[in-house]
Interface confidence: medium
């Protein structure tokens, strides 16, 4: 059974390589009863969704950059 069928997680797997310029926004979902793991869901500029690895240094930088740009807006 996939993760999605075992818990109500939205990230079945994570996209490894993604360029920050392709990302429009990022949503970080904290663990909860619906899903035991932190999930990072990116909305891409083409409108599609992708799950990113929250442990990846690049993803951490992307999240930090997105959060900072939100604060400055």
């Amino acid at each position: 059974a996939s993760v999605a069928t075992e818990l109500r997680c939205q990230c079945l797997q994570t996209l490894q390589g993604i360029h920050p310029k392709n990302i429009q926004s990022v949503n970080v979902k904290s663990p909860g009863p619906h899903c035991a793991q932190t999930e990072v869901i990116a909305t891409l500029k083409n409108g599609r969704k992708a799950c990113l690895n929250p442990a990846s240094p690049i993803v951490k930088k992307i999240i930090e950059k997105m959060l900072n740009s939100d604060k400055s807006n």
């Epitope: 059974a1 996939s2 999605a4 069928t5 818990l7 990230c11 996209l15 969704k49």
Partner: antibody, heavy 125, light 107 residues
Amino acid sequence: EVQLLESGGGLVQPGGSLRLSCAASGFTFSELSMSWVRQAPGKGLEWVSAISGSGGSTYYADSVKGRFTISRDNSKNTLYLQMNSLRAEDTAVYYCAREGGRLEPYYYYYAMDVWGQGTPVTVSS
Amino acid sequence: DIQMTQSPSSLSASVGDRVTITCRASQSISDNLHWYQQKPGKAPKLLIYDASNLESGVPSRFSGSGSGTDFTLTISSLQPEDFATYYCQQYYSTPLTFGQGTKLEIK
């Protein structure tokens, strides 16, 4: 054709029990989460419970926690809702719904995209 | 629990009108929101998933938008078969919750 068919509803006295069934066909039942949603007469939709594809994870609304049990038999393509200690406020039409929808290879969404016709439950003395 | 509030509760409109229904979440739910249509005596039907995606077979006059806490369902030109009750639903976290519904009636 993808189909869900509920059964088991009826009239029961307060404090009594009832077991609802939902027979699924037309899709790989074991791959998808399922939910029960109810609708009291003249009222809106209220989510009751959900279960993962394998049956390993279950979720309940506070209003039914400890009284209702959701389960599934993937070999029979059937979803169940065991309802105990029934109250007048449990009177409603009960729908089972499939939570479908793989959107992208790296992202999954849960939407109730297929519904049964509903089975009425009346709790009254 | 996440509360979903729809407005208006009821709405009278005419065939051909443009209609907008709003749904507000008590906390941010990203775009983890769906819209359903229900006709009397029938089961609900999925219209829009993930805030803005049209379910297969649903007419293009239906559209959804929003993210975070504020969402809208728009019907660009009402048809006779659109008179029904509409519900939003969040799946950001359990318990899953629905809005109280918006009843769309003929003026």
